[in-house]
């Protein structure tokens, strides 16, 4: 008799999830010499242990601690780039500006980027049919808790000037409910972080509005200032030119505003 299986509102675990995580771990540790000591099988076991046989609406940060410990990594604390709703451009930027890091440039972020996973209470099975949706089902699901945990740790590690890339095309350029707005902003350490510099990326079409004057950016400035961290903001009017100028800073067209 087939067991009744919980139907969640979100997509199920990414197919070939165990193989993908293991393969990514191996690839990452090969490319990054400082992480060569990592045993990828142990990483997978710790990852699996965080959610397998557990109710997918009852996951805690504590569940991920063994994985966090194995994935401990030191990135230059003054070279951190946060992002909100503009992941692709942030990743394109760090691919060019190799000394800066997004969360997905770290081992743990790299392992989980764009993947979904969940298990089932009291069985060792991975649920490939459906997983809880953050809004419709529950917030303490395996994926959300993972990103909350790694994002908090990433923000806590930051120092000096921290940069954040924000999407100027969205109605809420700064969204308090995003991971950046709800987790990272509140875990920057005022004793270590001097300034948060926001880069507001204009969309597929430049306009002459100063999006740094947007009410949601003012709200971000207020939150940051109250935490005794300085705030600055820049418009990136042409993201294509911005990336081009990161690649070729000597280009004569890169002296003007981008």
């Amino acid at each position: 008799v087939p067991r009744w299986r919980q139907q969640w509102s979100g997509p199920g675990t990414t197919k070939r999830f165990p193989e993908t995580v293991l393969a990514r771990c191996v690839k990452y540790t090969e490319i990054h010499p400082e992480m060569r000591h990592v045993d990828c099988q142990s990483v997978w076991d710790a990852f699996k242990g965080a959610f397998i046989s557990k109710h997918p609406c009852n996951i805690t940060e504590e569940d991920y601690q063994p994985l966090m410990k194995l994935g401990t990594q030191t990135v230059p604390c003054n070279k951190i780039l946060l992002w909100s709703r503009i992941k692709d451009l942030a990743h394109q930027f760090t691919q060019v500006q190799r000394d800066m890091f997004t969360l997905e440039d770290t081992l743990l972020g790299y392992l989980a980027d764009d993947l979904t996973w969940c298990g089932e209470f009291n069985t060792s099975k991975i649920n490939y049919q459906s997983c809880p949706d953050w809004r419709k089902d529950c917030s303490n699901n395996p994926v959300s808790v993972f990103w909350k945990t790694v994002s908090r740790r990433f923000a806590e590690a930051a120092c000096d000037v921290v940069h954040v890339m924000l999407n100027g095309s969205r109605s809420k350029i700064f969204d308090k409910n995003s991971t950046f707005g709800s987790v990272e902003v509140h875990n920057l350490q005022p004793e270590k972080v001097q300034t948060l510099e926001a880069w507001v990326i204009h969309g597929g079409r430049e306009d002459s509005r100063d999006l740094c004057q947007d009410p949601t950016i003012k709200e971000l400035e207020s939150i940051i200032s109250k935490r005794n961290i300085q705030f600055s903001c820049k418009n990136i009017y042409r993201p294509d030119k911005f990336l081009q100028c990161v690649k070729n800073p000597e280009d004569s067209s890169c002296t003007s505003e981008i």
Epitope: G204, R205, E206, D207, S208, R209, D210, N235, Y237, R238, S256, E257, I258
Partner: antibody
């Protein structure tokens, strides 16, 4: 307001610069477009300059026109006029975001290219 | 290149009637609503009637109505008045800050 000036009769190949003088708003956070209209014809967008100083041109206009600005004026240089460039030239302010459109127009300045 | 087509070069209607002017874009305008409408009368500056596809510009009578999204747009003038006789243009804004104008439609009021 916006107002164009500099239109006149020129011979083919003689560069000509038209000026759009603005008042009542700042060019640092407004975009200005240049549009032309040949006698008896429709409107044709040439190019725009934004608060950032970045410029954009219609494909057909690249190399033929140059847009630049100071704090209160926007210039359109016709690099090497031909008889096909005979037209009335307008400058217009471009609205942004939820109010996109050319919301303020000048009366135009007439350029005649003839040998 | 993006092309804006106003199919009718001229439309006519009697005073009190309604005219509809269409504007079709070869590709979607930016955010599906970067489309505006203009009125041109001889010897007068161009006047913006509708911006962002459907928003009435300040001081423009509500007889003028803009509609549409993406690639298909319409300007409707109802309760036509003799003063509405003019040429009407649509303009579109596209990704990459490219703009363009339709060919224009003359409205004749009988």
């Amino acid at each position: 307001s916006v107002e164009e000036s500099g239109g006149r009769l020129v011979t083919p190949g003689t560069p000509l610069t038209l000026t759009c003088t603005v008042s009542g708003f700042s060019l640092s956070n407004n975009a200005i477009s240049w549009v032309r209209q040949a006698p008896g014809k429709g409107l044709q967008w040439i190019g725009s300059i934004y608060g950032s100083g970045n410029t954009y041109y219609a494909t057909w206009a690249k190399g033929r026109f140059t847009v630049s600005k100071t704090s209160t004026t926007v210039d359109l240089k016709i690099n090497s006029p031909t008889t096909e460039d005979t037209a009335t030239y307008f400058c217009a302010r471009e609205g942004a975001g939820s109010s996109w459109g050319f919301n303020l127009w000048g009366p135009g300045t007439l350029v005649t290219v003839s040998s | 290149a993006q092309v804006l087509t106003q199919t009718a070069s001229s439309v006519s209607a009697a005073v009190g009637g309604t005219v509809t002017i269409s504007c079709q874009s070869s590709e979607s305008v930016y955010k599906n609503n970067y489309l505006s409408w203009y009125q041109q009368k001889p010897g007068q500056p161009l006047k913006c009637l509708i911006y962002s596809a459907s928003t009435l510009a300040s001081g423009v009578p509500s007889r003028f109505k803009g509609s549409g999204s993406g690639t298909q747009f319409t300007l409707t003038i109802s309760d036509l008045e003799s003063d509405d006789a003019a040429t009407y243009y649509c303009a579109g804004g596209y990704s990459g800050n490219i703009n363009g104008f339709g060919g224009g439609t003359e409205v004749v009021v009988k």
